[in-house]
Interface confidence: low
């Protein structure tokens, strides 16, 4: 079951899925000046069996010199600083990291893909939030959101996170020094 809307927005924070539940779709978007190849996949799909999951289908972009494209913006893969770069056009995924059963890792880039990745999450998906550079986290609770099904409708739980500028000194009583990111994840792993 696909989640109806996007995870909630938190001021000065970005979210990131550390793994993607089977059924998650990623649109095959191309940078400006490029378009999907004819007969190419519209999306990549996280699929698998009980023991392994991986990205099915493949995204491929081709030059659209002969045709204008709309709403397709992006730098080359190596310019995409805000995303982990496990790169490959066909849907291979890193395999030396511990895998969550029924989940896929971050899909690898493809040549000339768009900057912004458009995911279609499924019920049960969890995303983690962290403050953008220049802001620090004041935690009231979990800095994560889960897509849940309630009374036949999907909704995202509200992450309990406030991001405050480094110049501000306000801190909740008894709060420990906040960590940069959940479970010590690299600061570079940010928005989806």
């Amino acid at each position: 079951e696909l989640c109806d809307d996007d995870p909630p927005e938190i001021p000065h924070a970005t979210f990131k899925a550390m793994a993607y539940k089977e059924g998650t779709m990623l649109n095959c978007e191309c940078k400006r000046g490029f378009r999907r190849i004819k007969s190419g996949s519209l999306y990549m799909l996280c699929t698998g069996n009980s023991s392994h999951s991986s990205w099915d289908n493949q995204c491929q972009c081709t030059s659209s010199a002969t045709r204008n494209t709309t709403k397709q913006v992006t730098p080359q893969p190596e310019e995409q600083k805000e995303r982990k770069t496990t790169e490959m056009q066909s849907p291979m995924q890193p395999v030396d990291q511990a895998s969550l059963p029924g989940h896929c890792r971050e899909p690898p880039p493809w040549e000339n893909e768009a900057t912004e990745r458009i995911y279609h999450f499924v019920v049960g998906q969890m995303v983690y939030y962290q403050c953008v550079q220049g802001y620090r986290a004041l935690h009231r609770g979990p800095a994560e959101s889960v897509c849940k099904m309630t009374h036949g409708k999907t909704r995202w739980t509200q992450p309990q996170l406030i991001c405050t500028g480094e110049m501000e000194t306000s801190q909740f009583p008894g709060e420990e020094k906040p960590q940069a990111s959940p479970e010590g994840r690299p600061e570079s792993e940010t928005s989806c």
């Epitope: 991986s54 099915d56 496990t86 490959m88 849907p91 291979m92």
Partner: antibody, heavy 122, light 104 residues
Framework: QVRLQQSGPELVKPGASVQMSCKAS????????INWVKQRPGQGLEWIAW????????YFNENFKDKATLSVDKFSSTAFMLLSSLTSEDSAVYFC???????????????WGTGTTVTVSS | QIVLSQSPAILSASPGEKVTMTCRAS?????IHWYQQKPGSSPKPWIY???NLASGVPGRFSGSGSGTSYSLTVSRVEAEDAATYYC???????FGGGTELELK
């Protein structure tokens, strides 16, 4: 020691099919993609397809979609490629190769099989 | 589909000489890999992600390039370097036609 041992040479008639194998050892078979590569006599390398042994997902070079069928046997850590409707154009050495990636995430073929020679002749 | 063109097809060199072979892509790519193959043997990974030497590759080899032009250079050719070298696009697995390095 990581190894990919391929099956022996095949002499087949035009129109027939042939299946070759690639037995992996020295690593966890289900954790790495297996690729197949064709090399005609005196020619260059041509990528055919890959299979992920963990779940059987495959991806093909368009030129080989109707020619090759990939499968795996997880229990014997063996990958298979079936070539059908053979013609003289299919006479070649076929390699299996394991894909790995460097820290930048750039995938490459780090271990290659010994190669299987297929000769199509009447 | 990315097309990789290698030149020259055959490169003749004397021992100790410096040689460079080129791999050109039909459109801009992020990285390419190089493989070495000797007659009757399987290809071996030689240089990955444009400039990283694979395990066991002598330091006289180097790789460079960006965009549509990449090269493999041997600073001082030795007899054991005689082989065919193939470039490969990291992202679609397309191979170039190969450059055969032969010793005079």
């Amino acid at each position: 020691q990581v190894r990919l041992q391929q099956s022996g040479p095949e002499l087949v008639k035009p129109g027939a099919s042939v299946q070759m194998s690639c037995k992996a050892s020295g690593y966890t078979f289900t954790d790495y993609y297996i690729n197949w590569v064709k090399q005609r006599p005196g020619q260059g390398l041509e990528w055919i397809a890959w299979i992920f042994p963990g779940n059987g997902n495959t991806y093909f070079n368009e030129n080989f979609k109707d020619k090759a069928t990939l499968s795996v046997d997880k229990f014997s850590s063996t990958a298979f490629m079936l070539l059908s409707s053979l013609t003289s154009e299919d006479s070649a050495v076929y390699f299996c190769a394991r894909a790995t990636y460097d820290h930048g995430g750039y995938w490459y073929f780090d271990v290659w099989g010994t190669g299987t020679t297929v000769t199509v002749s009447s | 589909q990315i097309v990789l063109s290698q030149s020259p097809a055959i490169l003749s060199a004397s021992p100790g000489e410096k040689v460079t072979m080129t791999c050109r892509a039909s459109s801009s790519v992020s990285h390419i890999h190089w493989y070495q193959q000797k007659p009757g043997s399987s290809p071996k990974p030689w240089i990955y992600a444009t400039s990283n030497l694979a395990s066991g590759v002598p330091g006289r080899f180097s790789g460079s390039g960006s965009g549509t032009s990449y090269s493999l250079t041997v600073s001082r050719v030795e007899a054991e370097d005689a082989a065919t070298y193939y470039c490969q696009h990291w992202n679609s697995f397309t191979f170039g036609g190969g450059t055969e390095l032969e010793l005079k």
